[in-house]
Interface confidence: medium
Amino acid sequence: MAVTACQGLGFVVSLIGIAGIIAATCMDQWSTQDLYNNPVTAVFNYQGLWRSCVRESSGFTECRGYFTLLGLPAMLQAVRALMIVGIVLGAIGLLVSIFALKCIRIGSMEDSAKANMTLTSGIMFIVSGLCAIAGVSVFANMLVTNFWMSTANMYTGMGGMVQTVQTRYTFGAALFVGWVAGGLTLIGGVMMCIACRGLAPEETNYKAVSYHASGHSVAYKPGGFKASTGFGSNTKNKKIYDGGARTEDEVQSYPSKHDYV
């Protein structure tokens, strides 16, 4: 029961996380214009991974895509790649995890197969979350670097008169969405990996053997063995192999730590 809950919760958390990663990747507010010390206040510029937008004070917004790779920071390509890899891995992970869910029966799929699929999807979610967190962090670092460079340039000009003020950009909403979404995907992946451990039918170190003696009243008590090994009165090894015909269900075996009631 606990395994199913952990697996189900991991799936839901990862689903929300991947939806967030997709949303963050598509959002335009990765960087927003810093309005401090801004001479022209009628317009507000914000930028995403794919296009740059300008919103006027009237509410009118115009966006233009980056139709060229020239003039774009090289790091932007890395961020795009990281986010796309995160989405692709997450989507595949979701697909795999649907079939791995314990509550869904598909043919005669064994628990070991489901455990392997759960682990695979969990690892995919972890990598997906890390890709998103890395992508957002690289962009944030790029923003911080640009911010301080812009601040340095802001007060330079010819003859003391500032001729050009480079626009400073600060963190946009998409960064926070990306960080949270990446974290959720990561947590979901860890939960799937934990659930995998409970699903996997581990091999026991010993095999329980039942002896069937030919006679009904004959009990097999190996006295010679007892005497030679010093087991004495068999205090620890309480199991007595008494003969008799029994059904397979009646055969007693050692309780395993993996036996679930």
Partner: nanobody, 122 residues
Amino acid sequence: EVQLVESGGGLVQPGGSLRLSCAASGSIYRINAMAWYRQAPGKGREWVSEITSTGNTDYADSVKGRFTISRDNSKNTLYLQMNSLRAEDTAVYYCAAFIIPSVGMFTSRTYWGQGTLVTVSS
């Protein structure tokens, strides 16, 4: 590199009119907004008026009803029509433009002109 050049300043009597122009030239991808600022002798720079690419305008209370801002997008030129001029309007008038010089990230800048002097005196 983008350059802003103001013109039209000069000496005018109180109650008179003057039209300032500001021409933008250089590698301009898009002028999103343009503004007029002024700096009176011994004072800080004061915002006068601004206009967006779609023609939305805004004015400082001190010039409302007397000054009119306009722009010609095809010529990348900004205008300021100043009527009913007063002695307190005496200042160096600067043009500022929020420009995205090329398609890309972190390329937008606010450019300033060198200024044109307007003197209102009898």
